[in-house]
Amino acid sequence: SEVEYRAEVGQNAYLPCFYTPAAPGNLVPVCWGKGACPVFECGNVVLRTDERDVNYWTSRYWLNGDFRKGDVSLTIENVTLADSGIYCCRIQIPGIMNDEKFNLKLVIKPAKVTPAPTRQRDFTAAFPRMLTTRGHGPAETQTLGSLPDINLTQISTLANELRDSRLANDLRDSGATIRIG
């Protein structure tokens, strides 16, 4: 059975595969293919090494470890849902039927859709200005600074309190999802 590995759409996927060279630099050919390991070779080869270097690859498939020390783990750059499936790492040890074969299952999940709490930070950056509020007493100038610890509830409360002020207009103009009034 295959070992399962997961990645999100848009991330890099990592599929580990290792061997120990008999001597430093005494490398063994390796192939990576899409689909379970067949009896010989790799089907749908995406990357191949020889005794010296990577000698074949297709786009987005990388050996990113120290392959000279036997780290032939595959990195797939910027994955899509179509990258899901079984991958074969085949270490082609000389001799009849000596190959080491590893089937690895890659499961790609849709990217998490994060709601926009970053809006809050946008606010913070957007209002380091001075503003004058109209209140019951004399005009009062307040400095908002960069509002480092303010949260959306506080902003909403603040916006309600300052409904008539320029801040309220600024909040509205910023496109943020805060109901005022």
Epitope: D53, S59, E77
Partner: nanobody, 129 residues
Framework: QVQLQESGGGLVQAGGSLRLSCAAS????????MGWFRQAPGKEREFVAS????????SYADSVKGRFTVSRDNAKNTVYLQMNSLKPEDTAVYYC??????????????????????WGQGTQVTVSS
Amino acid sequence: QVQLQESGGGLVQAGGSLRLSCAASGFTFGSYVMGWFRQAPGKEREFVASISTSGGITSYADSVKGRFTVSRDNAKNTVYLQMNSLKPEDTAVYYCARDLTYYRTGGRLPDNANGYAYWGQGTQVTVSS
């Protein structure tokens, strides 16, 4: 013609940070892997880090893993090397280099000087203890 200009080097205390920049011109920057190397006095030039065309794949020498971060901005034709937790043994001239291969889309990021065609003049980084 191809030009690579490093900047951002200097003298820093052990444990400190520096950010090196390499401004590139004279070629289609976004179509080449870029690398950083360094050379200490009396030593051979050694690989530090490299980054794929899109910036999605990076590779590091064991000696800098977890401390250095390579990045690139293709809109600004610039590659960066953020160096944190610097050690005296990081003292060297740091060079930016451009890959030999046009639009390397996969395989392996080159970590040998022979894999790079063009080099900057270098910027000195000195880490004092």
